[in-house]
Interface confidence: medium
């Protein structure tokens, strides 16, 4: 039904999430999270994903920089708030972002591995 | 924030079960109590997919598994002998189980741990 | 493999400049930031400044700011320091460092040796 | 600026011990913290960076750990090729400032 999340996936907030154990380049995990009709985190406020807020991993999320527009934009389109990561403005632009869910997050090179989380919004 | 669902507002589904998060710290038997109170159990792990789920959410957590010594087996809250294997289950002292990252040990039960709640769909 | 070549020992008079030079290789330096610290003898670290070579920013510690130019040139894969009005004081070893992540130094030069001595 | 402290400047341990230093930030540094070895010959080498994460080619003897202000690198099993001196340095606001350094010596 509307309120459900397919298997293997978590229901939070009118949200399912899925949150791998793999490892995979930003790129990969864009894909992954693609081919199962999601997208890659988009975090509307860092205590979004607050059910794992003492969760020590870092996971790729749906940001990435935009020469274009000069700013971090979401898979979206959708510009980064200037409050979700204060230290953002020094967030090296070749690089993706990994997220805490504690709230931290890190630019690392998008070849590195990391875990990832895909969202779909179920209404 | 807006709720969905058959799991009550600010828990979790996952696999046709409901999970209360817990960031609290409780003793083994305040956080039975606290799951009663919330009309659920103590955590439960059912499978091996399950426990890999909950060691991703959560680093440790209580489980509802105990002995009443350490020469009484272990067993979950429904009497049943609990078959997996616990880790450190030859000292005394530790008649509790708890899961960390991806595998379960003996705790002593007076420890101040966070607990998760479940109910099954 | 990545490596970070950087210039010769240098002796120079106080009061003069020198010009510190790093070339990457094995990455693209407009990939990174590109920092220089440096370590007086028988001290600890000291972070002088970074540069984004894409895009030439640079951020400097106050003490240095105006002291340190930090520059790059991404044709050559190098990037440079250069200290000005030199005293005893900046006798030190100089590293340059290249590193993806913002806040974090990954791959360190050898290290240059910069004696201050009339 | 934000100060990092290392109170201890030398540690005499033995080959195969747990050897474990210390660094304390002057205020939080919201896990933006990294550890380097500095070999006596001078090369310095990216140990651990955001507290706990091992850079690539690091060998997994060694961990971090800590949060707010205090922070530890710990060596669980000492070996001859980690004498060294080791640096913390902060990444939470530049300036990017570093510790005095514990220099790690064999009894």
């Known amino acids: 039904d509307c309120c459900s999340c397919q298997e293997k996936w978590v229901g939070y907030r009118c949200n399912c999430y899925f949150i791998s154990s793999e490892q995979k380049t930003w790129n990969e995990s864009r894909h992954l999270c693609a081919s199962q009709k999601s997208s890659l985190l988009q975090l509307q406020n860092t205590d979004e994903l607050d059910f794992m807020s003492s969760s020590q991993q870092f996971y790729w999320i749906g940001l990435s920089y935009s020469e274009e527009h000069t700013a971090w934009l979401w898979e979206n389109g959708s510009a980064l708030s200037q409050y979700l990561f204060p230290s953002f403005e020094t967030f090296n632009t070749k690089n993706c972002i990994a997220y805490n869910p504690n709230g931290n997050a890190l630019d690392e090179s998008c070849e590195d591995k990391n875990r990832y989380i895909c969202k779909q919004q179920l209404i | 924030a807006r709720h969905c669902g058959h799991c009550p507002e600010e828990w979790i589904t996952y696999s046709n079960s409901c999970y209360y998060i817990g960031k609290e710290r409780r003793t083994w038997e305040e956080s039975l109590l606290a799951c009663t109170s919330k009309n659920s159990s103590l955590l439960s792990i059912d499978n091996e997919e399950e426990m890999k789920f909950l060691s991703i959410i959560s680093p440790s957590s209580w489980i509802g598994v105990f002995r009443n010594s350490s020469h009484h087996p272990w067993v979950t809250m429904n009497g049943l002998a609990f078959k997996h294997e616990i880790k450190d289950s030859d000292n005394a002292e530790l008649n509790c189980a708890v899961l960390q990252v991806n595998r379960l040990k003996s705790a002593q039960c007076g420890s101040s741990i966070i607990y998760h709640c479940k109910h099954k769909l | 493999e990545v490596q970070l070549q950087q210039s010769g020992a240098e002796l120079v008079m106080p009061g003069a400049s020198v010009k510190l030079s790093c070339t990457a290789s094995?990455?693209?330096?407009?990939?990174?930031?590109m920092h220089w610290v440096m370590q007086r003898p028988e001290q600890g670290l000291e972070w002088i400044g970074r540069?984004?070579?894409?895009?030439?920013?640079?951020n400097y510690d106050p003490r240095f700011q105006g002291k340190a130019t930090i520059t790059a040139d991404t044709s050559s894969n190098t990037a440079y320091l250069q200290f000005s009005s030199l005293t005893s004081e900046d006798t030190a070893v100089y590293y340059c460092?290249?590193?993806?992540?913002?806040?974090?130094?990954?791959?360190w030069g050898q290290g240059t040796l910069v004696t201050v001595s009339a | 600026d934000i100060q990092m402290t290392q109170t201890t400047s030398s540690l005499s341990a033995s080959l195969g011990d747990r050897v474990t230093i210390s660094c304390r930030a002057s205020?939080?540094?919201?896990?933006?913290l990294n550890w380097y070895q500095q070999k006596p010959d001078g090369t310095v080498k990216l140990l651990i960076y955001?507290?706990?994460r091992l850079h690539s080619g690091v060998p997994s003897r060694f961990s971090g750990s800590g949060s707010g202000t205090d922070y530890s690198l710990t060596i669980s099993n000492l070996e001859q090729e980690d004498i060294a001196t080791y640096f913390c340095?902060?990444?939470?606001?530049?300036?990017?400032?570093f510790g005095g350094g514990t220099k790690l010596e064999i009894k």
């Open positions: 460092v290249g590193g993806r992540g913002h806040t974090w130094f990954a791959y």
């Open positions: 094995g990455f693209n330096i407009k990939d990174t930031y």
């Open positions: 540069i984004d070579p894409a895009n030439v920013n640079t």
């Open positions: 205020q939080d540094i919201t896990n933006y």
């Open positions: 955001y507290t706990s």
């Open positions: 340095q902060q990444g939470n606001t530049l300036p990017y400032t």
